[in-house]
């Protein structure tokens, strides 16, 4: 009889230990959840406040109307320039008008002087047509001034106030473009 009672007591004690452990685990889990919630809320508030205070363009980008422009500080071939822009959520510059061309060339003059900058223009190897990266044709006043004699792929670049063409494998600076964020305030 005594043996039976002590066995039951031991089982109860074991149960109690397990319940304490479970309670401890639950308390830990709750604390961890609370911390995660705090982190989540802080992250959300941060995101919201930075979105609220954000300027239409990222740091080191230039704004003109609905567009943001990034003028690179490194040289690369045309294809790598294209990928560098994509990494920033942008594409190589697509010049839509003379006004945009004037803004770009004016800005470049202020920033860096007379260097070569890749834009998102390339010449189709078969037809010889110039096309922007999205497949659209440049307006007649925005065609590269000289036809490159290169047998390789030919791409467009800006220098001073001109749009010129060159072998896509040459190294130049580049200009990326993305839409400016609309202010909701």
């Amino acid at each position: 009889k005594l043996l039976q009672v002590s066995t039951i007591a031991m089982q109860q004690q074991e149960k109690l230990i397990q319940q304490e452990r479970a309670l401890l685990n639950f308390t830990e889990w709750k604390r961890s959840c609370a911390l995660q919630m705090k982190y989540c809320q802080a992250f959300m508030q941060n995101s919201l406040s930075s979105a609220h205070n954000s300027s239409p363009c990222p740091n080191n980008w230039i704004q003109n109307r609905e567009s943001c422009y990034y003028v690179s500080e490194i040289w690369s071939i045309w294809h790598t320039s294209q990928e560098n822009c994509l990494k920033e959520g942008s594409t190589l510059l697509q010049i839509e008008s003379k006004e945009e061309m004037d803004f770009i060339t004016g800005s470049l003059r202020k920033i860096k002087g007379s260097y070569d900058y890749w834009v998102g223009l390339s010449q189709d190897g078969h037809s010889g047509r110039w096309l922007w990266q999205d497949g659209s044709s440049p307006s007649p006043g925005l065609l590269p001034a000289e036809r490159s004699q290169s047998a390789n792929q030919v791409c467009g670049y800006v220098k001073s106030n001109s749009l010129l063409s060159s072998n896509c494998s040459t190294w130049k600076y580049f200009i990326c473009e993305k839409y400016a964020l609309r202010s909701s305030v």
Epitope: E83, L86, K87, E88, G89, S90, D134, G135, K178, Y179
Partner: nanobody, 115 residues
């Protein structure tokens, strides 16, 4: 990490169409653009088309007017609609996620254009 899963490849006749899909999961908030590359046997991997998270597309000269890249509204899935396919479009097509840091690649899907 960003995980990418491609689908939609297959065998198609010249002049036919295919639609490739690439579904992204994981840390997709870090992705600034997504694109499709292709690699034919013995050739280098080349960018076919890409689309930024603002929806701006970019295409290789060889596919302009034939291929169209698009995204779903959530931005998690990117599609490549390929029309007027040619034998020279035969390749393994890879999806790529562009971030400021690492770039992430899918496993690839085979596209074969043959009669």
């Amino acid at each position: 990490q960003v995980q990418l899963q491609e689908s939609g490849g297959g065998l198609v006749q010249p002049g036919g169409s295919l639609r490739l899909s690439c579904a992204a999961s994981g840390r997709i908030f870090s992705v600034n653009a997504m694109g499709w590359y292709r690699q034919a046997p013995g050739k280098q991997r080349e960018l076919v088309a890409a689309i930024t998270n603002q929806g701006a597309p970019t295409y290789a000269d060889s596919v302009k007017g034939r291929f169209t890249i698009s995204r779903d509204n959530a931005g998690n899935t990117v599609y490549l609609q390929m029309n007027s396919l040619r034998p020279e479009d035969t390749a393994v097509y890879y999806c790529k996620a562009f971030t400021r840091g690492d770039d992430y690649w899918g496993q690839g899907t085979q596209v074969t254009v043959s009669s």
